[in-house]
């Protein structure tokens, strides 16, 4: 027979030879880190067919690391369901607890003994320090000094000294989250008031209000013969500006085949019409309105769309 087979878990006793006589026997022993559990054979014989009789290393078992208990309020999860050396142990804490120590331990061979690479971690209760105090506002449970996992506080704004109220910018409720960190930044309390939205040749159709505070939403429509340049819906943002900006109502121009009528007093020119939130006059663009919805008015491609002089 030629050289005997090699195995992962056991090794030949003695030096291998280039060839073996029929009937000659070779013995194996478990490799370092493995131990023998009877009754399986750990030898083989050179058969008369010049082949080795069947043998396996199933009798040699990997050394295992000591059993690790689940940490209190957590779990120890063997990576491959085994404690054998070469494998990992993962540690997970239950919700509301966080890990102190190594998240992964390795089962390592020290000499012929399998031991863990470190001490098992512990699971500590998630606790948060009090959330931040905010200017012009307060939060619930302000007297509490330590907050547990998922404990929530809700912010509210103080009454304003002036005519306009404080608006709460951001989420009013935050909770004590993983890593002992609050779920988000604290909100802000400040006066947010947008200017009255003026649209020439159009009007507001919804969202009417005495004043326009944070998140106030207003919709517009243009007069007949005018089209909306911008969004028909605007919202008062946290900077006291309309987002998107206050739209404009621009005149639908007549087809180029007919001479445009002279401006009457009811028509405005673009250089002199402004919304309060718009910027100062710059170069006047050539406006291309969308396809007209107004019966009797041309579609844009039917006429030349010049600047609004």
């Amino acid at each position: 027979c030629e050289e005997p087979p090699t195995f992962e878990a056991m090794e030949l006793i003695g030096k291998p030879k280039p060839y073996y006589e029929i009937g000659e026997r070779v013995d194996y022993k478990c490799k370092k880190g493995y131990f023998y559990i009877p009754p399986l054979a750990t030898h083989t014989i050179c058969d008369r067919n010049h082949t080795w009789l069947p043998v396996s290393d199933d009798a040699c078992y990997r050394e295992t690391c000591p059993y690790i208990r689940d940490p209190l309020n957590g779990q120890a999860v063997p990576a491959n369901g085994t404690y054998e050396f070469g494998y990992q142990m993962h540690f997970i804490c239950n919700e509301g607890y966080y890990l102190i120590g190594e998240e992964i331990l390795y089962c390592e061979l020290k000499g012929s003994v399998a031991i863990w690479s470190g001490k098992p971690p512990i699971c500590e209760k998630v606790l948060c320090t009090p959330p931040p105090k905010i200017k012009n506002g307060k939060h619930t449970f302000s007297e509490v000094e330590v907050f547990e996992y998922l404990d929530a506080v809700t912010y509210s704004c103080d009454p304003a000294p002036g005519p306009d109220p404080f608006s709460l910018i951001g989420e009013s409720t935050i909770y004590c989250g993983d890593n002992s960190v609050w779920s988000r930044a604290a909100p802000e309390c400040k006066v947010v008031k947008c200017r009255f939205p003026v649209v020439e040749n159009g009007k507001q159709i919804s969202g009417f209000g005495k004043k326009f505070y944070y998140k106030a939403t207003v919709m517009f429509e243009c007069d007949k013969g005018f089209y909306l340049d911008g969004s028909d819906t605007i919202v008062c943002d946290s900077n006291s500006t309309w987002d998107p900006p206050v739209p404009k109502c621009l005149k639908v121009l007549p087809p180029s085949s007919t001479k445009p009528p002279a401006l009457s007093h009811s028509v405005s020119t673009s250089s002199t019409t402004k919304s309060p939130a718009s910027s100062a006059s710059g170069p006047r663009p050539t406006y291309k309105p969308p396809v007209s919805n107004y019966p009797g008015y041309p579609k844009p491609e039917e006429g030349i769309l010049d600047s609004l002089d």
Partner: antibody, heavy 118, light 107 residues
């Protein structure tokens, strides 16, 4: 508190021009939206136009071809330029600070009288 | 332009009377209506904004109501200092316009 004082009124012939001034004291004219309003016995109160803090303007279209509102920040003054004046433009002209960005006229000046007559 | 029509055009009341002035708009203006008082020899002064909100310093005997096209200014107990011309003003649409005025006199 800003005070607005109108000036520049007087007698002018039909077809003539006049520039009214609105001087601000105790504050910057560029910090406020300034409207011009006029009042006559025959036509009552009429809003003429507004200049916003950003320099933009809106006008009453009935007067837009003849009246122009402007502002000179260095002089802390707003202006109403009136051209092609007619006898029916005879009125007391007020400049007015728009209330905090809202079209509520809470701060009226004392007004300046413009008489258009030949 | 939106027309505002006030009624009556003038009225005479005794001190302590309840006075009602109406303002009708030619189209719906939501609550975008203000009231002013122009006392004799003075510039107009803002009394009420947004239909019913009392401007600072205005006595609470003044009140406003209405919505859409019909609006009312009430003086619960008129006083001698309340004489003058009362104007309504809309601001839903440019040009902002005023009513023709209601003159209030004391008997």
């Amino acid at each position: 508190e800003v005070q607005l004082v109108e000036s520049g009124g007087g007698l002018v012939q039909p077809g003539g021009s006049l520039r009214l001034s609105c001087a601000a004291s105790g504050g910057s004219v560029s910090s406020y939206d300034i409207s011009w309003i006029r009042q006559s016995p025959s036509r009552g109160l009429e809003w003429l136009g507004v200049i916003w803090t950003d320099g933009g303007t809106n006008y009453n279209s009935a007067f837009m071809s003849r009246f122009t509102i402007s502002r000179d920040d260095s002089k802390n003054t707003a202006y109403l330029q009136m051209n092609s004046l007619k006898t029916e433009d005879t009125a007391v002209y007020y400049c007015e600070r728009v209330y905090d960005g809202y079209p509520w006229f809470a701060y009226w000046g004392q007004g300046t009288l413009v008489t258009v007559s030949s | 332009a939106i027309q505002l029509t006030q009624s009556p055009s003038s009225l005479s009341a005794s001190v302590g009377d309840r006075v009602t002035i109406t303002c009708r708009a030619s189209q719906g203006i939501s609550n975008y209506l203000n009231w002013y008082l122009q006392k004799p020899g003075q510039s107009p002064q803002l009394l009420i904004y947004y239909t019913s909100s009392l401007f600072s310093g205005v006595p609470d005997r003044f009140s406003g109501s209405g919505s859409g096209t019909d609006f009312t200014l009430k003086i619960s107990r008129v006083e001698a200092e309340d004489v003058g011309v009362y104007y309504c003003q809309q601001y839903i649409k440019l040009p902002w316009t005023f009513g023709q005025g209601t003159k209030v006199e004391i008997k």
